[in-house]
Interface confidence: medium
C-alpha cells in the first residue's frame, strides 16, 4: 500500500465532515494479548505487544486509532488498533494510516498534488434524511476550496499536516501546532502512549518517514517498561 510522506494525523482532533460519522468502531479481530496486534484486518506480531486500552484516538500511536476490537462495533472496551491502509473503509480520518485521510468512507492518499492551489473535493452528503423527504439520497457535490498556495515551512503554524511543506508534519508545540520535520531513521519516536499522557505531550513528535515504523530499539528490549526507547526503523 502506498503511503506518501504527508499525513492526516493532525486531522484527528477535528470533527469529521469528510471522514464520516465517528461511530461504529468495530474491528475484524479480537485482541490476543501479547501475541497478535489487531486492527486494519492485518495480523502483525509486535515485540511484547499488549493491547492498550484507550478512550480516544489521541491516546494511541500515530499509526493507530482507538476502537472496540469486536466485530460490528458493539460497545465494549476500546483498544489501540492498527491504522487502515489506503482504499480501506473508514469512518473518520484517525482510522487511516499516515499519508492517508478518510474521504467518502475510504482511506485515500493525501498526496502532495491533492493539496496544491485550488482543488476540487468530491464529497457525499445527504439531505432530507428522516425529515423533509422520504429517501436520503447520497449526493455527489463538487466543492471548490482554496487551499494554502504556499506550504508552511518548519516552525510555521498549521492546522493539519497538509498545511506543511513536504517532509514536515503538523504537530503540537506548547498549545498550538507547528510544522515539524518528519522523523528519519534512527530518530526517537513516540509509540503507544499511556492513557491521559497524550494531553501532557506539549512537544509532539512527527511520525516516522516513508518506509519506517516506530519500534522498540533492539538493545532496549531488556530495559524496564518505562524506559523503553522507540526509534524509527526500516520495515
Amino acid at each position: 500500500t502506498l503511503n506518501s510522506v504527508l499525513n492526516s494525523n493532525a486531522i484527528k482532533n477535528l470533527p469529521p465532515p469528510l471522514g464520516g460519522a465517528a461511530g461504529h468502531p468495530g474491528s475484524a479481530v479480537s485482541a490476543a494479548p501479547g501475541i497478535l496486534y489487531p486492527g486494519g484486518n492485518k495480523y502483525q506480531t509486535i515485540d511484547n505487544y499488549q493491547p492498550y486500552p484507550c478512550a480516544e484516538d489521541e491516546e494511541c500511536g500515530t499509526d493507530e486509532y482507538c476502537a472496540s476490537p469486536t466485530r460490528g462495533g458493539d460497545a465494549g472496551v476500546q483498544i489501540c488498533l492498527a491504522c487502515r491502509k489506503r482504499r480501506k473503509r473508514c469512518m473518520r480520518h484517525a482510522m487511516c494510516c499516515p499519508g492517508n485521510y478518510c474521504k467518502n468512507g475510504i482511506c485515500v492518499s493525501s498526496d502532495q498534488n491533492h493539496f496544491r492551489g485550488e482543488i476540487e473535493e468530491t464529497i457525499t452528503e445527504s439531505f432530507g434524511n428522516d425529515h423533509s423527504t422520504l429517501d436520503g439520497y447520497s449526493r455527489r457535490t463538487t466543492l471548490s476550496s482554496k487551499m494554502y498556495h504556499t506550504k508552511g515551512q518548519e516552525g510555521s503554524v498549521c492546522l493539519r499536516s497538509s498545511d506543511c511543506a513536504s517532509g514536515l508534519c503538523c504537530a503540537r508545540h506548547f498549545w498550538s501546532k507547528i510544522c515539524k520535520p518528519v522523523l528519519k531513521e534512527g530518530q526517537v519516536c513516540t509509540k503507544h502512549r499511556r492513557k491521559g499522557s497524550h494531553g501532557l505531550e506539549i512537544f509532539q513528535r512527527c511520525y516516522c518517514g516513508e518506509g519506517l515504523s516506530c519500534r522498540i530499539q533492539k538493545d532496549h528490549h531488556q530495559a524496564s517498561n518505562s524506559s523503553r526507547l522507540h526509534t524509527c526503523q526500516r520495515h
Epitope: 464520516g20 460519522a21 461511530g23 461504529h24 468495530g26 474491528s27 475484524a28 479481530v29 484486518n41 492485518k42 495480523y43 466485530r71 460490528g72 462495533g73 482504499r87 473503509r89 469512518m91 467518502n104 468512507g105 475510504i106 457525499t124 452528503e125 445527504s126 434524511n129 436520503g136 447520497s138
Partner: antibody, heavy 119, light 107 residues
Framework: QVQLVQSGAEVKKPGASVKVSCKAS????????ISWVRQATGLGLEWMGW????????GYAQNFQGRVTMTWNTSISTVYMELSSLRSEDTAVYYC????????????WGRGTTVTVSS | DIQMTQSPSSLSASVGDRVTITCQAS??????LNWYQQKPGKAPKLLIY???NLETGVPSRFSGSGSGTDFTFTISSLQPEDIATYYC?????????FGQGTRLEIK
C-alpha cells in the same frame, strides 16, 4: 430476528431502470454498511457497491459507475439500489447484504430480488 | 482488480471425507479473505472471515487457512448438508471480488 427483506421480482425492458428495496430489522441499521451483490443465473457473485446509512457514503464498483445509485431512508431502515439503462445481461438475482466495514464480511443477506430484462 | 481463482471448479466427495478447496489471489492480499457457502436457490452464507476465523454459529468442521496469495478452505468431515457452492472473497482492495465458485456434490 436479524434480517434483510427485499422487494419482489421485477421484469423490465432494455433501457429502463429498476429500483430494488432492502428493509433491515433486528439490528442497528446505521452501524453497518449495506452491500449489493448480484448473481446471473448459473454464474458467480459480483459486488456492485456499498453504502453506509449512517454517513450516506457510497462506493460503487467501476462496472456499475454511472448506472447504479444507492439511497436510503433511515426512518424505515430501508436502503434502495437503482440500476438504470438496463440491458439483457443485467438479468440476475440482486442481493443486499449487511456488511461489516472492517472486514467486508457479508454476514446477513436478503433473499434476493430477481430482475429480468427482456424486450 | 484483484482476480480470485478457485480450484477445483467442482468436486465430488463422500460423506465423512476431508474436502479441500483452494483460492489463489492475483496479488498479495494478506489475510483479507472470506469464505461463503451458497446452497441452490438461497443467498450466500458467511462461513469464514479474515482467512481463518470461524463465523459465529458455523460448525467447527469448517476451517480456513493461508495468507498472501494462497488460501485453503477445508471441511474436515463432509456432511450431506454441506452440498453447496463455495466462494472465496477478497477485500484487500476495492472493488471486492469473488472467486468463480466451487461446486461440491456428494458421491
Amino acid at each position: 430476528q436479524v434480517q434483510l427483506v427485499q422487494s419482489g421480482a421485477e421484469v423490465k425492458k432494455p433501457g429502463a431502470s429498476v429500483k430494488v428495496s432492502c428493509k433491515a430489522s433486528g439490528f442497528t441499521f446505521t452501524s453497518y454498511d449495506i452491500s449489493w451483490v448480484r448473481q446471473a443465473t448459473g454464474l458467480g457473485l459480483e459486488w456492485m457497491g456499498w453504502m453506509n446509512p449512517s454517513s450516506g457514503y457510497t462506493g460503487y464498483a467501476q462496472n456499475f459507475q454511472g448506472r447504479v445509485t444507492m439511497t436510503w431512508n433511515t426512518s424505515i431502515s430501508t436502503v434502495y439500489m437503482e440500476l438504470s439503462s438496463l440491458r439483457s445481461e443485467d438479468t440476475a438475482v440482486y442481493y443486499c447484504a449487511r456488511t461489516d466495514y472492517y472486514y467486508y464480511g457479508m454476514d446477513v443477506w436478503g433473499r434476493g430480488t430477481t430482475v429480468t430484462v427482456s424486450s | 482488480d484483484i482476480q480470485m481463482t478457485q480450484s477445483p471448479s467442482s468436486l465430488s466427495a463422500s460423506v465423512g471425507d476431508r474436502v479441500t478447496i483452494t483460492c489463489q489471489a492475483s496479488q498479495d492480499i494478506s489475510k483479507d479473505l472470506n469464505w461463503y457457502q451458497q446452497k441452490p436457490g438461497k443467498a450466500p452464507k458467511l462461513l469464514i472471515y479474515d482467512a481463518s476465523n470461524l463465523e459465529t454459529g458455523v460448525p467447527s468442521r469448517f476451517s480456513g487457512s493461508g495468507s498472501g496469495t494462497d488460501f485453503t478452505f477445508t471441511i474436515s468431515s463432509l456432511q450431506p448438508e454441506d452440498i453447496a457452492t463455495y466462494y472465496c472473497q477478497q477485500y484487500d482492495d476495492l472493488p471486492i471480488t469473488f472467486g468463480q465458485g466451487t461446486r461440491l456434490e456428494i458421491k
